[in-house]
Interface confidence: medium
């Protein structure tokens, strides 16, 4: 009686069970009654991860410079290629896909947390008694400078995007 | 051949849920995200939501009560179900590979809520 | 989720002109901008991914530029299948609770 399910790594076809081919082979032709499965090797830039019945091995992933990818690792007959960001991008998706410039903080922003290979620079705006009046992608909300340490007065109170500003304190003549 | 198929039932009544099947071919959907995409009848694109290569879901703040966005890697299959249905969810839906950068859409199939 | 706002909504133009849509970004999403044509009864069609870099077989007719919130799309010297209607989309992504995208209104390129 012809099986109605097979073994791991095995697949039916005309009422019988065929080994299924391994990772980083394709298949070329079915088991017979008489012939086992007929498997390749992927050519050079293909892949298969699985056991399988593929006819075609997938391409490797081309991590291409103009979407600012480099190889983080190259791929071999049974994995993909792995893509990552060149230095100063970071990717735009989990399976970075392309990559976009680090994004920098405005005035007014101060940087929370520095971008890394796979997340954004991280922005946070500058509470009160900080500011930042650059576009950065590293520079932090800086503390507005202390006028009664230098022994001066505020005359212009500071933002979140300015500095306060000192001036002598006015003395009765 | 790499490609993107949407299908599913063309006429679903309202506060029905909503289901769609997108099956990819000639890559693989680990190495790749894939999001969903929806255009009203005679108007602009809405972006639904996606699943990144590593499983991750990302909604658009409209579609976060209502939607679920899978993946079934061995079927080569992405999923989307939109809850609750009305009228208003009338459109054509889309399948794309990518982000933002989506390099390659389905036809997409056209879905009318309707008693 | 990120406002993206297209303009013009309409674009009536001869072929041979030049032709130009912005978009506007509701924050600062550095490059990650794409734009689409679309024709009709047809999915869209990606042309410029990040801002400025052409897609395969996009022709060079078709330029992109900008970054952070400001960003344009010219078509140098407009031709008969270029009357279509074009969308930009676009977003970032740190985390799975920290991102956003979005899609332009959309910009309907009509013959004069």
């Known amino acids: 009686e012809p099986p109605t399910a097979c073994r791991e790594k095995q697949y039916l076809i005309n009422s019988q069970c065929c080994s299924l081919c391994q990772p980083g082979q394709k298949l070329v032709s079915d088991c017979t009654e008489f012939t086992e499965t007929e498997c390749l090797p992927c050519g050079e830039s293909e892949f298969l991860d699985t056991w399988n019945r593929e006819t075609h091995c997938h391409q490797h992933k081309y991590c291409d410079p103009n979407l600012g990818l480099r190889v983080q690792q190259k791929g071999t007959s049974e994995t993909d290629t792995i893509c990552t960001c060149e230095e100063g991008w970071h990717c735009t998706s989990e399976a970075c896909e392309s990559c976009v410039l680090h994004r920098s903080c405005s005035p007014g922003f101060g940087v929370k947390q520095i971008a890394t290979g796979v997340s954004d620079t991280i922005c946070e705006p500058c509470p009160v008694g900080f500011f930042s009046n650059v576009s950065s992608a590293f520079e932090k909300c800086h503390p507005w400078t202390s006028c009664e340490t230098k022994d001066l007065v505020v005359q212009q109170a500071g933002t979140n995007k300015t500095d306060v500003v000192c001036g002598p304190q006015d003395r009765l003549r | 051949q790499v490609q993107v198929q949407e299908s599913g039932p063309g006429l679903v009544k309202p506060s029905d849920t909503l289901s769609l099947t997108c099956t990819v071919s000639?890559?693989?959907?680990?190495?790749?995200?894939m999001s969903w995409i929806r255009q009203p009848p005679g108007k602009g694109l809405e972006w639904i939501g996606a699943?990144?290569?590593?499983?991750?879901?990302y909604y658009a703040s409209w579609a976060k009560s209502r939607v679920t966005i899978s993946v079934d890697t061995s079927l080569n299959q992405v999923s989307l179900k939109l809850s609750s249905v009305t009228a208003a969810d009338t459109a054509v839906y889309y399948c794309?590979?990518?982000?933002?950068?989506?390099?390659?859409w389905g036809q997409g199939t056209l879905v009318t809520v309707s008693s | 989720d990120i406002q993206l706002t297209q303009s013009p909504s309409f674009l009536s133009a001869s072929v041979g002109d030049r032709v130009t849509i912005t978009c506007q970004a509701s924050?600062?999403?550095?490059?990650?901008l794409a734009w689409y044509q679309q024709k009709p009864g047809k999915p869209p069609k990606l042309l410029i991914f990040?801002?400025?870099n052409l897609a395969s077989g996009v022709p060079s007719r078709f330029s992109g530029s900008g970054s952070g919130t400001e960003f344009t799309l010219t078509i140098s010297s407009l031709q008969p299948e270029d009357f279509a209607t074009y969308y930009c989309?676009?977003?970032?992504?740190?985390?799975?609770?920290?991102f956003g995208q979005g899609f332009g209104g959309g910009t309907k390129v009509e013959i004069k």
């Open positions: 794309a590979r990518g982000w933002t950068r989506l390099d390659l």
């Open positions: 000639g890559f693989s959907l680990s190495s790749y995200d």
């Open positions: 699943i990144g290569g590593a499983g991750g879901t």
């Open positions: 924050e600062d999403i550095s490059s990650n």
């Open positions: 990040p801002a400025s």
């Open positions: 989309q676009g977003g970032y992504w740190t985390s799975t609770s920290n």
